[in-house]
Amino acid sequence: MMTGTIETTGNISAEKGGSIILQCHLSSTTAQVTQVNWEQQDQLLAICNADLGWHISPSFKDRVAPGPGLGLTLQSLTVNDTGEYFCIYHTYPDGTYTGRIFLEVLESSVAEHGARFQIP
């Protein structure tokens, strides 16, 4: 039975040209995290694997940095980066947990962080 929950940074906004940290945290489970995949829509951004370390997908290498922790840092943001981001936790024995973050990249300096929320 899957008992864990994923807490994410929720709905966030950031300025064009700036950077943002995408963070997810898995709690309330003793399951072993095998791998965390970061995806934007259906595109693979990055992988963090317990045995093999970090991998940033080739098309994002220039603008994506691993960490902090299992999180992901997006740099040199453009308005095209606006959209949904998913952290996918592959765990044993629970299975797969998915967290969702919505990022809005703004032209002006009105960017402010949204509230944290949970996805069971």
Epitope: N37, L44, I47, N49, D51, L52, G53, H55, Y92
Partner: antibody, heavy 120, light 110 residues
Framework: EVQLLESGGDLVQPGGSLRLSCAAS????????MSWVRQAPGKGLEWVSL????????YYADSVKDRFTISRDNSKNTLYLQMNSLRAEDTAVYYC?????????????WGQGTTVTVSS | QSVLTQPLSASGTPGQRVTISCSGV????????VSWYQQLPGTAPKLLIY???QRPSGVPDRFSGSKSGTSASLAISGLQSEDEADYYC???????????FGGGTKLTVL
């Protein structure tokens, strides 16, 4: 179409060297962990070596450690196996295989194999 | 000597259900995922089951995988003559840090 094509298999004398290649096509090679698996005549499958996405983490079976070196050239979509100090017991069909996006899940694409014969 | 243990052979008649076992230890099957492969004579292996119980697209639902403790099994229901092949289980071993295979099971359809 997702494809793996091995080459470089040959007849070689004991103590000799050989380099196997595996050309990948139809997928983003950089995003996948790769392995070499071999099969001696009339025997079962034996894992040989594994390499992560950018080649900075490698693992080997005890039987080939310090003799074989796995590497990859992502710009050429090619996986390699450098085989040194070859022995009669290295005679086998060598397959290159792609791991599932979560590498521990399994090997989802296999090449057709290339034959290595070590004999005097 | 393989790290994972499989029976050397198994057999069944067309339409029957056959199960192939795979036994490991606490550092592989018990805490990791198992995958199963079918190898027809003279061909490369083909993935049948990944993540212990999931089927890749194109694999008939006659093939199913399960796992309990340090053992895993592959079940083939509605056995067909084209299922005659060698079957291998494999898992990542956390202690050895290596990919370990079973010795293979030769399935004969009588």
């Amino acid at each position: 179409e997702v494809q793996l094509l091995e080459s470089g298999g040959d007849l070689v004398q004991p103590g000799g060297s050989l380099r196997l290649s595996c050309a990948a096509s139809g997928f983003t090679f950089d995003d996948y962990v790769m392995s070499w698996v071999r099969q001696a005549p009339g025997k079962g499958l034996e894992w040989v070596s594994l390499i992560n996405w950018n080649g900075d983490k490698t693992y080997y079976a005890d039987s080939v450690k310090d003799r074989f070196t796995i590497s990859r050239d992502n710009s050429k979509n090619t996986l390699y196996l450098q085989m040194n100090s070859l022995r009669a017991e290295d005679t086998a069909v060598y397959y290159c295989a792609r791991h599932w996006i979560v590498f521990q899940y399994g090997l989802d694409v296999w090449g057709q194999g290339t034959t290595v014969t070590v004999s005097s | 000597q393989s790290v994972l243990t499989q029976p050397l052979s198994a057999s069944g008649t067309p339409g029957q259900r056959v199960t192939i076992s795979c036994s490991g230890v606490s550092s592989n099957i018990e805490i990791k995922y198992v995958s199963w492969y079918q190898q027809l004579p003279g061909t490369a292996p083909k993935l049948l089951i990944y993540n212990s119980h999931q089927r890749p697209s194109g694999v008939p639902d006659r093939f199913s995988g399960s796992k309990s403790g340090t053992s895993a099994s592959l079940a083939i229901s509605g056995l067909q003559s084209e299922d005659e092949a060698d079957y291998y289980c494999t898992s990542w071993d956390d202690r050895l840090k290596s990919w370990v295979f079973g010795g293979g099971t030769k399935l004969t359809v009588l």
